[in-house]
């Protein structure tokens, strides 16, 4: 969480951003909130990016003002216009690319004063893993698949019964480049699994950590998946 203040005493307002991550190919959200104003026409929102000459986005007098927008952001940005009045200056970004990573500034002007806060935006790819029993294998085998990751993640297997065990010798992980030549499909196979045990496939890079669990008993199979972004710090 980054909380920024204006510079001049009573003419400063609090602006708050949250560091976040964008999943390339999807739309992303750059979060920013501020002390609201009574009149929409008195609010100016400017989004800037370090190293970019033009503006990322500008909203003033109740509407978008995009004459100074940088070329790389044309048609790719939107604020939640109906939520500006309650202090939401968050920016939606269309079709996130690797090059969108960087430091952004959310700069706000209202009748109460000015304020700004920076936001670190990481970009990559992350997805939920799914763990299944591989019935095609010659021995009891689990297969963990996740369709999109970047940068290349690490994959670690764990088990509820054998806590702390190292499964690297009985697992094999491969990375297959997807059609857009950036993201990769992750496939990890765990051999010699035992029944009545819960296994976890943990995939992690510097952006996200995802876990796929599978519990195999004689009568049923239960699955669960979880994904967590690693850098969601507010400022």
């Amino acid at each position: 969480l980054i909380i920024g203040f204006g510079i001049s005493g009573r003419h400063s307002i609090t602006v708050t951003t949250v560091a976040s991550a964008g999943n390339i190919g999807e739309d992303g959200i750059l979060s920013c909130t501020f002390e609201p104003d009574i009149k929409l026409s008195d609010i100016v929102i400017q989004w800037l990016k370090e190293g970019v000459l033009g503006l990322v986005h500008e909203f003033k007098e109740g509407k978008d003002e995009l004459s100074e927008q940088d070329e790389m952001f044309r048609g790719r940005t939107a604020v939640f216009a109906d939520q500006v009045i309650v202090g939401n200056a968050s920016l939606r970004l269309k079709n996130v690319q690797l090059t969108d990573a960087g430091t952004y500034k959310c700069y706000i002007i209202t009748s109460k004063g000015k304020g700004n806060a920076n936001l670190e935006y990481k970009t990559g790819a992350f997805s939920m893993p799914e763990v299944n029993v591989d019935y095609n294998a010659s021995s009891e085998t689990l297969r963990c698949e996740a369709p999109r990751w970047f940068p290349q993640p690490t994959v670690v297997w764990a088990s509820q019964v054998d806590q702390g065990a190292n499964f690297s010798e009985v697992s094999n992980t491969s990375f297959e480049l997807n059609s857009e030549n950036v993201t990769m499909k992750v496939v990890s196979v765990l051999y010699n699994v035992t029944i009545n045990n819960t296994y976890s496939c943990m995939i992690e890079n510097d952006i996200a950590k995802a876990t796929g669990d599978i519990k195999v008993t004689e009568s049923e199979i239960k699955r669960r998946s979880h994904l967590q972004l690693l850098n969601s710090k507010a400022s």
């Epitope: 190919g25 739309d27 044309r74 939107a78 604020v79 079709n95 997805s127 999109r148």
Partner: antibody
Framework: QVQLQESGPGLVKPSGTLSLTCAVS?????????WSWVRQPPGKGLEAIGE???????NYNPSLKSRVTISVDKSKNQFSLKLSSVTAADTAIYYC????????????????WGQGTLVTVSS | EIVMTQSPATLSVSPGERATLSCRAS??????LAWYQQKPGQAPWLLIY???TRATGIPARFSGSGSGTEFTLTISSLQSEDFAVYYC?????????FGQGTKLEIK
């Protein structure tokens, strides 16, 4: 009421280039919307080809990217599709469509469509 | 790319009855899903976006639900003009992709 109208040759020779234009009326191509091309082979499903913003920014379907060019002509309020090295597999009804963007909603669904034009690839 | 799978391929229902169409995504698309209706010789027509929001002018008998990977289009009381092909489309991830369609026919 926005209207879209596709135009272009209905027959293209194999290895040739398919060229279509979409004329926009009842609205400006310089609005906040993206403008798309979608195709539908006879009796089959729909496939997004690509999209363009009035600034010239584009997104292309990776499966067609090496063969596709979409351009915009703001003075004529129209946008165009070129698909090179065509084969019989490119025979389809080609639709132009407008992205349904409105502030606070995601881009990506299509709220206005042209009536479509059938393009046959054959010698 | 995200694969959208619709079921059933064909659905036979009598006028006045309820029709339920399903759409499944190969990975989560959040609520970024649209439904279209297409009649022979016509372009698709937007019914639902945001998984559950009806487009302008769409009758209340059409409703959408779901999020993540599982979605449903329900037509509460079928009218004669509702028999057509229905497509779902995800717009969470580029390239946007469509299901193969469900043909709704008169029983």
């Amino acid at each position: 009421q926005v209207q879209l109208q596709e135009s272009g040759p209905g027959l293209v020779k194999p290895s040739g280039t398919l060229s279509l234009t979409c004329a926009v009326s009842g609205g400006s191509i310089s609005s906040s919307n993206w403008w798309s091309w979608v195709r539908q082979p006879p009796g089959k499903g729909l496939e997004a080809i690509g999209e363009i913003y009035h600034s010239g920014n584009t997104n292309y379907n990776p499966s067609l990217k090496s063969r596709v060019t979409i351009s915009v002509d703001k003075s004529k309020n129209q946008f165009s599709l070129k698909l090179s090295s065509v084969t019989a597999a490119d025979t389809a009804i080609y639709y132009c469509a407008r992205d349904g963007y409105s502030s606070g909603w995601y881009w990506g669904y299509f709220d206005y469509w042209g009536q479509g034009t059938l393009v046959t690839v054959s010698s | 790319e995200i694969v959208m799978t619709q079921s059933p391929a064909t659905l036979s229902v009598s006028p006045g009855e309820r029709a339920t169409l399903s759409c499944r995504a190969s990975q989560s698309v959040n609520s970024n899903l649209a439904w279209y209706q297409q009649k022979p010789g016509q372009a698709p027509w937007l019914l639902i976006y945001g998984a559950s929001t009806r487009a302008t002018g769409i009758p209340a008998r059409f409703s959408g639900s779901g999020s993540g990977t599982e979605f449903t289009l329900t037509i509460s009381s079928l009218q004669s003009e509702d028999f057509a092909v229905y497509y779902c489309q995800q717009y969470n991830h580029w390239p946007y992709t469509f299901g193969q369609g469900t043909k709704l026919e008169i029983k």
